[in-house]
């Protein structure tokens, strides 16, 4: 059936707690005001409506919920907790809704939630327990399979006095709740580094997108545990070279495809191993597009066309001959 728009909504009180009791029984499949609903598609869309809260009277059948382009600002604990619970909700899209605060337990009481998209929200305050719901050292497993967190970095003046990377990673690792996560997208977040423990604790990952960040090196990152990894997006970062350890780990992943376009590769003597590896590997997609950025004399040279004679390092002068 085509989406139907509800004119006015007269439904339940659903506070941010699972224990909420309705003020009056909601009509079972009523569509909230300002939303469009299709029961056949099990879909509710409340898009670009300047909502400041999650609608309280969501129909119990909802499987796909789009709350994009709103002004939610904060997701409190139990923001989607309803009585009865939204037991079918599997895909939740909150992108571009001006969220800057996601509290502990914001997604509790959603037993079927498999896909969550929080992209394009300036998340200055992402609780470590946003996805685990509990501060226990080991939480109940989250049902999440896909977590999309592209462009969630707040403007610099709104960032707290802590590492943004650290805040995000704490939420990913808390309580080991996301052991079943298969897709993680963290593109466009100004990440300078990837904390070394994050990937080891997400063993089910199939797809990891770290494109359009500011990663300079992968030296301390281990991909060894990610035996199911199928795609690794590292385009548009600040990578200068991949070292032997990383190359060997990537080569050892049975299903992997790696995307490395648009990084400022430094084509000096440290690049020799990577060039050799690139010539042999089938892992890198579009490897013929990779070009040198530095030094100046090597700019725009195709990595696959280089040989060892091209890859030299300027000799280090003894201190007595160095000039300031």
């Amino acid at each position: 059936s085509s989406p139907t728009s509800s004119a006015s909504s007269f439904s339940s009180s659903a506070p941010f707690l699972a224990s909420a009791v309705s003020a009056q029984p909601p009509l079972p499949d009523q569509c909230p005001a300002l939303c469009e609903c299709s029961e056949a598609a099990r879909t509710v869309k409340c898009v670009n409506r300047n909502l400041t809260e999650v609608p309280t009277d969501l129909p119990a059948y909802v499987r796909n919920l789009f709350l994009t382009g709103n002004q939610l600002a904060v997701l409190p604990a139990g923001a989607f907790a309803r009585r009865p619970p939204l037991a079918e909700l599997a895909a939740l899209n909150l992108s571009g809704s001006r969220l800057d605060e996601v509290r502990a337990g914001a997604f509790e009481h959603l037993p079927s939630l498999r896909q969550l998209d929080l992209s394009h929200n300036p998340l200055a305050d992402l609780s470590p327990f946003a996805f685990s719901g509990s501060n226990a050292s080991v939480s109940a497993p989250s049902p999440l399979v896909e977590l999309i967190l592209n462009h969630i970095v707040p403007p610099e003046d709104e960032r707290q006095n802590r590492s943004f990377e650290g805040m995000v990673v704490a939420a990913l690792l808390a309580g080991r709740a996301l052991q079943g996560l298969r897709r993680l997208e963290l593109a466009s977040n100004h990440f300078l580094y990837l904390p070394r423990d994050v990937l080891a604790q997400l063993p089910s990952l199939r797809h990891l997108d770290l494109s359009n960040n500011s990663l300079v090196s992968l030296t301390y990152v281990s991909f060894r545990n990610l035996t199911h990894l199928e795609s690794l997006h590292l385009e548009d970062n600040a990578l200068k070279v991949l070292h032997n350890g990383t190359l060997a780990e990537l080569q050892g992943l049975p299903h992997i495809r790696v995307f490395l376009d648009n990084n400022p590769w430094v084509c000096d003597c440290h690049m020799a191993d990577m060039v050799t590896w690139l010539k042999e590997t089938e892992v890198v997609q579009g490897k013929d597009r990779l070009t040198c950025a530095y030094p100046e004399k090597m700019r725009n040279r195709v990595l696959l066309e280089l040989n060892s004679a091209d890859l030299d390092c300027d000799p280090i002068l003894p201190p007595s001959l160095q000039t300031s």
Epitope: S8, S9, S11, S12, S13, P15, F16, L17, A23, P32, A33, L34, C35, C46, R49, N50, L51, T52, E53, V54, P55, T56, D57, Q71, A73, V74, P76, A77, D100, E101, R103, A124, D125, E158, Q160
Partner: antibody
């Protein structure tokens, strides 16, 4: 000038019903969430209920849940509170108040209040 | 529910003297993004009026002798020089979660 004017209060017996209204003017009513707050005689302030700007969200204090229903008509710039199964302890001055959002908001404009007396 | 406890419950101040009211929350009502604590004054026979939003932001039209501070669980409303028109009951209120709750009120009178 922002104005909120409550009406509909009065004397009612326990178990009875009343419908309060709040007429808004001087601002774009449909852009704001609205609350009801009450004040029992000689007592402090108690939040009662909230409705979002587009009637997508409704919240109630536990003391009134299941008995009171908040609603609004943006075309008429009006807010309502349907009060059923009234009790002695519902006796209070009822204020409507404006907010820009539920959690990130505050009560930045108040009506003068309407008095509800529940007594046999 | 979050309980807000105000102290003192009443105070009597000489005009021109400062006054201070404390509001303590039973749990934190601050995040790194926002402080969910607001202050109101209810003058005799009138509805409440907003004085301070988000702990420290003066509402438009409110005299700058009023100021607010605090975060987490402890908040303070200060009046630098009390005037006769400041009499009434002062309330703090949180908007951290449902239900929204108010402090029990602090009655200010003039000596």
């Amino acid at each position: 000038e922002v104005q909120l004017v409550e009406s509909g209060g009065g004397l009612v017996q326990p178990g009875g019903s009343l419908r309060l209204s709040c007429a808004a003017s001087g601002f774009t009513f449909s852009n704001f969430g609205m609350h009801w707050v009450r004040q029992a005689p000689g007592k402090g302030l108690e939040w009662v209920s909230y409705i979002s700007s587009g009637s997508t969200s409704f919240y109630y204090a536990d003391t009134v849940k299941g008995r009171f229903t908040i609603s609004r008509d943006n075309a008429k710039n009006s807010l309502y509170l349907q009060m059923n199964s009234l009790r002695d302890e519902d006796t209070a001055v009822y204020y409507c108040a404006r907010t820009n959002s539920l959690l990130r908001g505050f009560f930045d404009a108040w009506g003068q209040g309407t008095t509800v007396t529940v007594s046999s | 529910d979050i309980v807000l406890t105000q102290t003192p419950l009443s105070l009597s101040v000489t005009p021109g003297q400062p006054a201070s009211i404390s509001c303590r929350a039973s749990q934190s009502v601050s995040s790194s993004s926002y402080t969910y604590l607001h202050w109101y004054l209810q003058k005799p026979g009138q509805p409440p009026q907003l004085l301070i939003k988000s702990a420290s932001n003066l509402e438009s039209g409110v005299p700058d002798r009023f100021s607010g501070s605090g975060s987490g669980t402890d908040f303070t409303l200060k009046i630098s020089r009390v005037e006769a028109e400041d009499v009434g009951v002062y309330y703090c209120q949180h908007s951290w979660e449902i239900p929204l709750t108010f402090g029990q009120g602090t009655k200010l009178e003039i000596k």
